[in-house]
Interface confidence: low
């Protein structure tokens, strides 16, 4: 059966179809190319007679059209109103007919497009945004990317006019992006150049560091406010309420105990008339801000109730503090047996008792800072066993035996274990 | 996201050079036009030098011409702004900043690096 193939059948306006015939019948007197779907004489492109291999243009030929022998037909040039169809006539030697029709369409090369926005300085949480690809463009396909990916699904974006128009309503300073569009149609694709969508944000709550709280006397103090805003925010410094200069580094050096007081941090954006603020309390004091952790020494860890007493030492290297003593989380002294002495440094208990058993610590602290020891063992004995029952671990006392009448943690249990098993293989 | 990160400030004699950089992420800075803003205590924000890639043109305020020079490698995504013969009335806040072709404000700044000359 004779039939038309277009190649290609999207064709770009300026480019070239060939209408290729397929199952061209023997024994041809001739044949002719209308434009449109049937033979009509008004709309003759070509005819060709073999015979005399001449080719005659018809009323609908405009000088772009070429004819091969094998009847296919070229057509140069194209321009929109060469889309449609086109029918192949062709006359065999018996003056018998047939006939067959092929088709193309034509689409206009695109433009290089560009966008146009509705607002070039929204403001975060508050403003939309419009922005349109141009030009409008018949029978093409519009796209959007927004840092070269595809648009993210999200609610506050909504596309529009057959995708041509990208809103973003309520927009955040996380859409500050690269937008771009894109047209498509079967015969080519332009992207254009990005438009970075400028959100005007904040400023946030300002941030000041560093984050230290208390200075000594002497030191210099150097802070500095930051906050988040876009343009970037303007900033000023106030102590104790009173204005002190516009930076946004603040700067005294040699710093007294008059410098301490309330710093506040004043961030203004002008353009989004946004303003924040942020108070921090200096306090310059010879105490120490970090008090170090303690250590307690004891006389013995293990002792015989009723017989023996125990010293217990506090040991800090700083100055200016208070010690205070516990005893599974009593405050102590907490019996006629035990007293302070040294300022609190030592506790004694004289004599020892069973329930005076368990762990003890001690806290050191100013009126700005504290800290504690690690708990230390005190082990009562009321059985008179030989010393080789005791062995060491980790420079520390504990009983070796069952008598119960220790009062040790299972975490200590399981120490002794292995130090048994050490001790063993060492006799 | 859009980012700018500028860098390069510091404290500089009278008569010396320093030179800023300003590293883009999220776009291509050749799709744009970049400049260099600077913000001093009490005076007017003041654009002094901006390049624009796509269109092939760089232009300086009257207050820096021959002194600063603005430039940009497109495969680092980086603008530079190389600051000669530098004077006390240079110290600012150096702000990098995009110009989109959509209104060509430069309204998407950096956080900025400042520049102190003084002796």
């Known amino acids: 059966k004779l039939t038309i193939e277009s190649t290609p059948f999207n064709v770009a306006e300026g480019k070239e179809v060939l209408l290729l015939v397929h199952n061209l019948p023997q024994h041809l007197f001739g044949y002719s190319w209308y434009k449109g779907e049937r033979v009509d004489g008004n709309r003759q492109i070509i005819g060709y007679v073999i015979g005399t291999q001449q080719a005659t243009p018809g009323p609908a030929y405009s000088g772009r059209e070429i004819i091969y022998p094998n009847a296919s037909l070229l057509i140069q040039n194209i321009i929109q109103n060469d889309t449609g169809f086109y029918t192949l006539h062709v006359i065999k030697s018996d003056l018998v007919n047939e006939e067959a029709t092929g088709q193309f369409r034509v689409y206009p090369e695109l433009p290089k497009p560009s966008i146009s926005s509705n607002n070039s300085k929204p403001v975060e949480d508050k403003d939309a945004v419009a922005f349109t690809c141009e030009p409008e463009t018949q029978d093409a396909t519009y796209l959007w990317w927004v840092n070269n990916q595809s648009l993210p699904v999200s609610p506050r974006l909504q596309l529009s006019n057959g995708n041509r128009t990208l809103t973003l309503f309520n927009v955040t300073r996380n859409d500050s992006a690269s937008y771009k569009c894109e047209t498509q149609n079967p015969v080519s694709a332009r992207r254009s150049d990005s438009v970075i969508l400028n959100v005007l944000y904040g400023p946030d709550t300002p941030t000041i560091s560093p984050s230290d709280t208390y200075y000594r006397p002497g030191a210099n103090l150097s802070l500095s406010c930051y906050a988040a805003s876009n343009p970037p925010a303007q900033y000023s410094w106030l102590i104790n309420g009173t204005f002190q200069q516009s930076t946004q580094e603040l700067f005294i050096p040699n710093i007294t105990v008059n410098n301490s007081g309330s710093y506040t941090c004043h961030a203004n954006n002008s353009v989004t008339g946004c303003n924040r603020t942020t108070v921090k309390t200096i306090i310059v004091t010879e105490l120490s801000p970090v008090v170090a952790k303690p250590q307690i020494k004891a006389s013995k860890t293990t002792v015989t109730g009723d017989k023996d007493s125990v010293n217990l030492t506090c040991s800090t290297n700083d100055t200016g503090i208070s010690i205070r003593w516990f005893f599974k989380n009593q405050s102590l002294p907490s019996s006629e047996r035990m007293k302070l002495s040294q300022g609190n440094i030592t506790l004694s208990i004289n004599p020892v008792k069973r329930e005076d058993a368990g762990t003890y610590w001690c806290e050191v602290f100013n009126p700005i800072s504290k800290n504690q020891s690690d708990p230390i063992m005190l082990n009562v004995n009321y059985n008179a066993l030989p010393q080789e029952n005791l062995i060491n671990v980790d420079e520390q006392l504990y009983f070796q035996g069952g008598s119960g009448l220790n009062d040790i943690f299972e975490a200590q249990k399981i120490e002794w274990h292995e130090a048994r098993a050490h001790h063993h293989h060492h006799h | 996201e859009v980012q700018l990160v500028e860098s390069g400030g510091g404290l500089v004699q009278p008569g010396g050079s320093l030179r800023l950089s300003c590293a883009a992420s999220g776009f291509n800075i050749k799709d744009t036009c970049i400049g260099w803003v600077r913000r001093a205590p009490g005076k007017e924000e003041e654009l002094v030098a901006a390049?624009?890639?796509?269109?092939?043109?760089?232009r300086y305020a009257d207050s820096v011409k021959g002194r600063f020079t603005i430039s940009a490698d497109t495969s680092k995504n980086t603008a530079y702004l190389q600051m000669n013969s530098l004077r006390a009335e240079d110290t600012a806040v150096y702000y990098c900043a995009i110009a989109s072709p959509v209104d060509q404000y430069y309204n998407y700044w950096g956080q900025g690096t400042t520049v102190t000359v003084s002796s």
């Open positions: 390049i624009c890639e796509y269109k092939g043109y760089t």
